[in-house]
Interface confidence: low
């Protein structure tokens, strides 16, 4: 059960993990205090044979896919949560492990 | 641009959208007022020649796909906002405008 | 019951300062905005600002931000209202309102609970 | 600032009287619109919320309608108690703003 590692010089053109920073201002997700940005990764690549796993998405996640429409068939495989500040619905702010936010292998379904 | 509209009693294998609500609770995303639930929609099925669109996520969105591995190569290509109740990076309460939170029309990328 | 009881009248000359308190009381003071309202005689209501007391960030009409200040103090369960450099014009009935959440889409809240306001008077 | 113009300003009506006071807003304030009810000398009291809801308490023949720009209260059958003033609210964007108020005498 493994993914490829790329970056924006490679020339893998197969299934591949991209580097990707989410900057939540920017997608309008304000409500989310901390971080304002961190290191999500996407997936972006060609669907052969490798990579069977597929993740279940259970949460909202970002899709930003600077590569193009090859993308939404190579999807994570893995993924991690990060701690994050946020409001809640009691109108407190809460500091928790949000799921599946970063994109540690990725696969084709 | 046109896309199917199934439901769960559909023989339809293609791409098709999907009736789904999305719990932002049971997703642990509880910095989300209100609406707790709302009507999304998914994106699933078999990808040929038809509904080339592919809408750009530029958003965290929603990707739970009860229908299995087709989904992620058959994707929302036409999505509207939600009106939600939540907390912003300056500490307060905010009534907007969500962009693409609900699916209106599936394609393929 | 919930209860917002708030400070006596007040007469203030030009320049001067003053500060409203709301003393909250049959509910958990903490975990609801505080909003302040304004009426001056015979006219409309005009909304001054609000304040979370679980952290005390508060959010002001750009009318006001200059002058007035929402503060909170959580152990007496008391929210106050400074306003500086008073004008004639800003005589007024001064309340506080409890927002209450009822938590069943966007915006579904409202002014549960006010205070009995408290007359602030600017002459000289 | 969202601008909140409601009319008329005062209105003369009769005890058992249905009367429909509007609001209208500057710009779509997508139903995020509250209506209260004030007496002399003493604090508002709200009536409806989100355009349409009923404040808990709130007799059902207060009713609001509307969406976009055009909001209205209506008042099926008027009271002796009813008579007061009443304002929208906006709270769609801060600042939050009130309408200038309908006062609602006895004919």
């Known amino acids: 059960d493994f993914g490829l590692d790329c970056d924006e010089h490679s020339t893998e053109s197969r299934c591949c993990r991209y580097p990707l920073t989410v900057d939540f201002e920017a997608f309008g997700w304000d409500w989310i205090i901390a971080p304002k940005r961190y290191k999500a990764n996407y997936c972006s690549g060609e669907c052969e044979f490798v990579f069977l796993q597929k993740y279940p998405h259970t949460h909202l996640v970002h899709q930003a896919n600077p590569r193009g429409s090859a993308g939404p068939c190579c999807t994570p495989t893995k993924m991690s949560p990060i701690n994050m500040l946020y409001f809640n619905g009691k109108e407190q702010i809460i500091y928790g492990k949000i799921p599946a936010m970063v994109v540690d292998r990725c696969g084709c379904s | 641009d046109f896309g199917l509209d199934c439901d769960e009693h559909s023989t339809e294998s293609r791409c098709c959208r999907y009736p789904l609500t999305v719990d932002f609770e049971a997703f642990g995303w509880d910095w989300i007022i209100a609406p707790k639930r709302y009507k999304a929609n998914y994106c699933s099925g078999e990808c040929e020649f038809v509904f080339l669109q592919k809408y750009p996520h530029t958003h965290l969105v929603h990707q739970a796909n009860p229908r299995g591995s087709a989904g992620p190569c058959c994707t929302p290509t036409k999505m509207s906002p939600i009106n939600m109740l939540y907390f912003n990076g300056k500490e307060q309460i905010i009534y907007g405008k969500i962009p693409a939170m609900v699916v209106d029309r599936c394609g393929c990328s | 019951q919930v209860q917002l009881v708030q400070s006596g009248a007040e007469v203030k000359k030009p320049g001067a300062s003053v500060k409203v308190s709301c003393k909250a009381s049959?509910?958990?003071?903490?975990?609801?905005?505080m909003h302040w309202v304004r009426q001056a005689p015979g006219q409309g209501l005009e909304w001054i600002g609000n304040?979370?007391?679980?952290?005390?960030?508060?959010n002001y009409n750009q009318r006001f931000k200059a002058r007035a200040t929402l503060t909170t103090d959580t152990s007496t369960s008391t929210a106050y209202m400074e306003l500086r450099s008073l004008r004639s014009d800003d005589t007024a009935v001064y309340y506080c309102?409890?927002?209450?959440?009822?938590?069943?889409?966007?915006?579904?809240?409202?002014?549960?609970?006010w205070g009995q306001g408290t007359l602030v008077t600017v002459s000289s | 600032d969202i601008q909140m113009t409601q009319s008329p300003s005062s209105l003369s009506a009769s005890v058992g009287d249905r009367v429909t006071i509007t609001c209208k807003a500057s710009?779509?304030?997508?139903?995020?619109l509250s209506w209260f009810q004030q007496k002399p000398g003493k604090a508002p009291k709200s009536l409806i919320y989100?355009?349409?809801r009923l404040v808990d308490g709130v007799p059902s023949k207060f009713s609001g309608s509307g969406s976009g720009q055009d909001y209205t209260l209506t008042i099926s059958s008027l009271q002796p108690e009813d008579f007061a003033t009443y304002y929208c609210?906006?709270?769609?964007?801060?600042?939050?703003?009130f309408g200038q108020g309908t006062k609602l005498e006895i004919k």
């Open positions: 304040i979370y007391p679980y952290n005390g960030v508060s």
């Open positions: 609210l906006q709270s769609d964007e801060f600042p939050l703003t």
């Open positions: 989100r355009a349409n």
């Open positions: 710009q779509d304030i997508n139903s995020y």
């Open positions: 309102a409890r927002r209450y959440y009822y938590g069943t889409g966007p915006a579904d809240w409202y002014y549960d609970v």
């Open positions: 049959g509910y958990s003071f903490t975990g609801y905005f």
